[in-house]
Interface confidence: low
């Protein structure tokens, strides 16, 4: 019998309110044994797959997706999904990235530390269980 895959979680470092031009890193977490993590935009066909998965704890694995210089176009909802053979997980909750026009730099106190979305309610839109772990040629750690 196939195991039920736990839903991934998503968080953003240093937070979800990021000054224009600063960096943000999305952290996707799931169980051990994950082959591919995917960070995707809401219903948007641009997404980023990575197989650069590290063990965050004895029971958790994670992947990190970095945007070096955030622009207005990076604002919006993000979520994670992972592939643990032989199937894809459900999606994480959405995490909303806000881009703030400010003179503050990457370490500005305007950023909200430790924002995350854990495995609570299931989003109502498209299931990704049909997905094959096909990379779109986007580089992990450099989403856009």
């Amino acid at each position: 019998q196939e195991e039920d895959l736990p839903r991934p979680s998503i968080s953003a470092e240093p937070g979800t309110v990021i000054p224009l031009g600063s960096h943000v890193t999305f952290v996707c977490r799931g169980p051990v044994g994950v082959q591919t993590f995917r960070l995707e935009r809401e219903s948007r066909s641009t997404y980023n797959d990575t197989e650069d998965v590290s063990q965050a704890s004895p029971s958790e694995s994670e992947a990190r997706f970095r945007i070096d210089s955030v622009s207005e176009g990076n604002a919006g909802p993000y979520r994670c999904i992972y592939y643990k053979p032989p199937k894809w997980s459900e999606q994480s909750d959405y995490l909303e990235l806000l881009v703030k026009e400010t003179s503050g730099g990457p370490d500005s106190p305007d950023t909200e530390p430790g924002s995350s979305a854990g495995p609570t309610q299931r989003p109502s839109d498209n299931s990704h269980n049909e997905h094959a772990p096909a990379s779109q040629g986007l580089k992990a750690e450099h989403l856009y």
Epitope: E42, S45, G73, D125, P133, A134
Partner: antibody, heavy 118, light 110 residues
Framework: EQSVEESGGRLVTPGTPLTLTCTVS????????MCWVRQAPGKGLEYIGI?????STGYANWAKGRFTVSKASNTVDLKISSPTTEDTATYFC??????????????WGPGTLVTISS | ELDMTQTPASVSEPVGGTVTIKCQAS??????LAWYQQKPGQRPKLLIY???TLASGVPSRFKGSGSGTDFTLTISDLECADAASYYC????????????FGGGTEVEIK
Amino acid sequence: EQSVEESGGRLVTPGTPLTLTCTVSGFSLSSFHMCWVRQAPGKGLEYIGIIYPGGSTGYANWAKGRFTVSKASNTVDLKISSPTTEDTATYFCARVNYGDWINGMDLWGPGTLVTISS
Amino acid sequence: ELDMTQTPASVSEPVGGTVTIKCQASQSIGSNLAWYQQKPGQRPKLLIYKASTLASGVPSRFKGSGSGTDFTLTISDLECADAASYYCQQAYWSGNVDNVFGGGTEVEIK
């Protein structure tokens, strides 16, 4: 040569389910997103939905529940579950440029005409 | 919800003239905008993507500009063959939209 061609357009009565097929050649559906777009007579282009390489789908708000996009190895289908006269249009299948939505749609079929009339 | 407004609905200019078509997004889309040309009875043709990048085989008379919410397609040195409808398309979201295309602009060559 890379090409996209729609088929299945015909005259049907309102409420009769209809499936249109887009056949692609010269490239792989495992590398490209594919869209369906329609155009009513004398009107503009109207986006219906998209299918991603992994098989998941996205739809315009108005199209959700009315249309279903699916695919096989070299075909992409559009099912109209219960057509009305307002669904009369030419239906186009289009490939997303360089496999990424931000690049627009670079390869279009000639379209297939669907007429819904009683 | 992201909507696209295109103006004017129609325009008429002489051969050799210049046409300017504007497209406005209801929210910022960066440079994620495409332009298409469609002649009567034909399929649409991609002209420009990423707001200003010419698609393969498109002459440099076609120029796209703009970012954020306001975009422009300029066609200079107009030729008879440029008579067509032109559409903008937001290339930012593929979901949670009613339509990704603007309403279109019909260009007539005098």
